[in-house]
Interface confidence: low
């Protein structure tokens, strides 16, 4: 018996087609993805093959103005239109709190939404009961397939799920649900979830009875053969894990942003064992036409967005590099722009002794979610900025000791090279790292811009001095592992909305041209 699994993950509000780097579509003939194009391909496969499941592994929420304006109603509407069979909850589904998940999505979705390792407690338990499920048994042709969901245990650190949801260890929570499916004589089981590729592989290895793992969260691109676009494969598709009980378990992910449709064919024997698996992500490029009815619906929903966001704020005459390949590894000019805007937003010349009360900014590279291409007449709109800063956070003012800042910069590179979000972009700070040194001891120089001076200049950080710093509320709250900031901050004042800070700065400057200028340096010392 053969099953076709079509899957998406980390779509992040890319309902419309995008450019190749998943930012706003500029040249339609070269654009990719979007739900209208996705629907065309899904329907084509549904017509051609008998047993097809369309699954999403979480993080539909958050990423463009679509989510800013529609707050999840767009996800329910268009996933219903595409007739998704199931979805796992991702961490970003909690970005607007539990209410922001229940009302627009859980109550409106016509497909099961799954997570076995999220347990509700207190008053929320009855309110959310039945709105999401640990697993669902789906009829497919003459057979049944069990889908069991999971969500990153880190969600409380990554989003806003509140205090009435407990996120359990994925493996511990999944095993009893899979065992239950086995007692129901369901012998073909897919784990669908959002915890990242490493956890996907661990689930494949450790959870007895899971036949296939369909994952998300780490935006992992897997491919067998020559990849069709810019993404470099992290491994073959499917990635085969040998489970502890000796089975070969295919693990798949489909990158992110709706650029690819995962396509996996699985052959099962009569006892539900996987005999073979093969496939590849399908690049949803412009050779696949957008479905006219879905496209018309998109255009109808689009009107509200146009009014909201298409006015030009200012112009850039340089490429604003907000790619994860840059901002999570080195100084990027998008990070410099945002930090400069954050400082500019906090100019308060109230004392002759100080040119300003604050001179320093830090910004987690993982919070920069998109580049902006200057080749669109240089125009920057609210919509462009909403793709760069999609999380609706604030830029806050904190007071920290120098020793806390030193810890933060060590944390910035403690696992450098894995494209993790904690790599810090800066303003008013010059930092030098030596990555050949052991984690926790990689900051070899840390100079900060003086405030109590008429001519600003850089001085070495003093461990016992108290400094003011502008940073995202996400970092002030200990996000991305910056627990030392949360634990050790001496004062925290909430600031303005992140997009508004940057848009105001761009409007003020009119034309911008941020550079990479040596704020962050990597010094390679060889033993």
């Amino acid at each position: 018996w053969e099953l076709t699994i079509l899957h998406t993950n980390d779509v992040h509000s890319r309902l419309e087609q995008t450019s190749e780097d998943s930012s706003k579509c500029v040249n339609a003939s070269r654009c990719m993805g979007g739900v209208a194009r996705l629907f065309t391909k899904v329907q084509q496969i549904r017509r051609a093959e008998p047993n097809v499941l369309l699954l999403d592994a979480g993080d539909q929420y958050q990423g463009t103005i679509w989510f800013t304006v529609y707050k999840g109603a767009e996800v329910a509407h268009f996933m219903n239109a595409l007739r998704y069979d199931a979805m796992a909850l991702g961490n970003h589904e909690f970005d607007n709190g539990v209410e922001g998940l229940i009302e627009p999505l859980l109550k409106e979705a016509k497909f099961p939404i799954l997570s076995a390792n999220i347990k509700a407690k207190g008053p929320l338990a009855s309110q959310i009961s039945g709105l999401y499920l640990p697993y669902k048994v789906l009829p497919v042709g003459d057979e049944v397939v069990g889908i069991v969901g999971y969500t990153s245990k880190e969600t409380p650190f990554l989003s806003n799920p509140g205090t009435n949801l407990v996120f359990e260890d994925e493996i511990t929570a999944l095993q009893p649900e899979v065992d239950k499916l086995k007692t129901l004589n369901v012998n073909k089981i897919i784990a669908l979830g959002h915890s990242g590729f490493e956890m996907d592989k661990l689930i494949a290895q450790k959870v007895r009875g899971v036949d296939v793992v369909v994952g998300g969260h780490s935006n992992t691109f897997l491919y067998t053969g020559n990849p069709p676009s810019k993404e470099v494969p992290a491994g073959k598709y499917p990635f085969i894990v040998t489970s502890d009980d000796g089975r070969k378990v295919p693990v798949v992910q489909a990158y992110a942003f709706g650029k690819y449709l995962g396509y996996l064919k699985i052959e099962f024997d009569e006892r539900g064992n996987v005999i073979s698996s093969h496939g590849n992500p399908i690049l949803l490029n412009s050779s696949i036409p957008e479905d006219p009815s879905i496209k018309a619906d998109i255009n109808k929903w689009r009107i509200k967005l146009d009014n909201y966001s298409t006015q030009e704020l200012g112009k850039t005459i340089v490429y604003l590099d907000g790619s994860s390949q840059s901002c999570r590894f080195r100084e990027c000019n998008m990070g410099n722009l945002i930090c400069d805007a954050m400082i500019n937003n906090n100019l308060r010349h109230t004392d002759e002794m100080f040119w300003n009360h604050v001179s320093m900014c830090i910004l987690n590279g993982g919070g920069i979610r998109s580049p902006i291409d200057e080749r669109n007449n240089g125009t920057i709109t609210w919509e462009n900025l909403a793709a760069v800063l999609p999380f609706g956070g604030t830029f806050d003012l904190v007071q920290l000791k120098g020793s806390t800042l030193k810890k933060a910069f060590e944390h910035s590179v403690h696992r450098y090279g894995q494209s993790t979000g904690e790599f810090l972009q800066v303003g008013g700070i010059h930092v030098v790292y030596d990555l050949s040194r052991k984690p926790g001891d990689r900051v070899v120089k840390l100079d900060v811009l003086c405030t109590k001076c008429r001519v600003p200049s850089y001085d070495p950080l003093k461990m016992d001095e108290v400094y003011k710093v502008i940073l995202p509320n996400f970092l002030a709250n200990g996000g991305d592992g910056f627990q030392m900031i949360k634990d050790e901050l001496l004062r925290h004042d909430s600031g303005d909305q992140d997009i508004n800070v940057v848009s105001t700065y761009i409007s003020k400057m009119k034309v911008i041209y941020p550079a990479v200028e040596g704020r962050i340096k990597h010094h390679h010392h060889h033993h």
């Epitope: 403690h414 926790g440 627990q483």
Partner: antibody, heavy 117, light 107 residues
Framework: QVQLQESGPGLVKPSETLSLTCTVS?????????WNWIRQPPGKGLEWIGY???????NYNPSLKNRVTISRDTSKNQFSLKLSSVTAADTAVYYC??????????WGQGTLVTVSS | DIQMTQSPSSLSASVGDRVTITCRAS??????LAWYQQKPGKAPKLLIY???NLGEGVPSRFSGSGSGTDFTLTISSLQPEDFATYYC?????????FGGGTKVEIK
């Protein structure tokens, strides 16, 4: 300078619970890193028991999971190991160490626990 | 669990010798490998992390290489204080596991 020091009884009777404490100086266990217990039976190799994280999550070696509990007392900057239903096979030098998803850079000097009636 | 297999389990060598110890992982652990030195009655000491990076204060005669599943610790010129037991350990995923150890003895 980060220092770790194990303490606890050196002799435990079979079927009882082994209890050890690791006192950390020079670094707050709530700041970062994972705080581990590792053991080494006499003349044998090293076995990772489990850890408690800076944000109070646990991870245990599946081979010991049903018997082990690692907890912490942040006011004393200590973390503790409890291993229940011990047998002679649990006789070992027990080390506490900082690390986990990073290598084990700092270790205690180790404490020998003998299981015997 | 990922098994770490070290070889040889013991070796005899003289001061000045070049010594090589190998460690094989049962699955791909990328570069998430550390080497430790342990002397009798003492705690292990970190020598190498991330397969090839030298720990702080570790003499440059120690070096590490490899990635994926096969790793090597090399002592370019054995010194009297190097006679000890050496362990490899992966920190790719839990449970973290150690190799069985290699005892380096005086010939």
């Amino acid at each position: 300078q980060v220092q770790l020091q194990e303490s606890g009884p050196g002799l435990v009777k079979p079927s009882e619970t082994l209890s050890l404490t690791c006192t950390v100086s020079g670094y707050s266990i709530t700041s970062r890193y994972y705080w581990n217990w590792i053991r080494q039976p006499p003349g044998k190799g090293l076995e990772w028991i489990g850890y408690i994280t800076y944000d109070d999550n646990n991870n245990y070696n599946p081979s010991l999971k049903n018997r082990v509990t690692i907890s912490r007392d942040t006011s004393k900057n200590q973390f503790s190991l409890k291993l229940s239903s011990v047998t002679a096979a649990d006789t070992a030098v027990y080390y506490c160490a900082r690390g986990g998803w990073d290598p084990f850079l700092y270790w205690g000097q180790g404490t020998l626990v003998t299981v015997s009636s | 669990d990922i098994q770490m297999t070290q070889s040889p389990s013991s070796l005899s060598a003289s001061v000045g010798d070049r010594v090589t110890i190998t460690c094989r992982a049962s699955d791909n652990i990328y570069s998430y490998l550390a080497w430790y030195q342990q002397k009798p009655g003492k705690a292990p000491k970190l020598l190498i992390y991330s397969a090839k990076n030298l720990g702080e204060g570790v003499p440059s005669r120690f070096s590490g290489s490899g990635s994926g599943t096969d790793f090597t610790l090399t002592i370019s010129s054995l010194q009297p204080e190097d006679f000890a037991t050496y362990y490899c350990q992966h920190y790719y995923g839990t449970p973290f596991t150690f190799g069985g150890g290699t005892k380096v003895e005086i010939k």
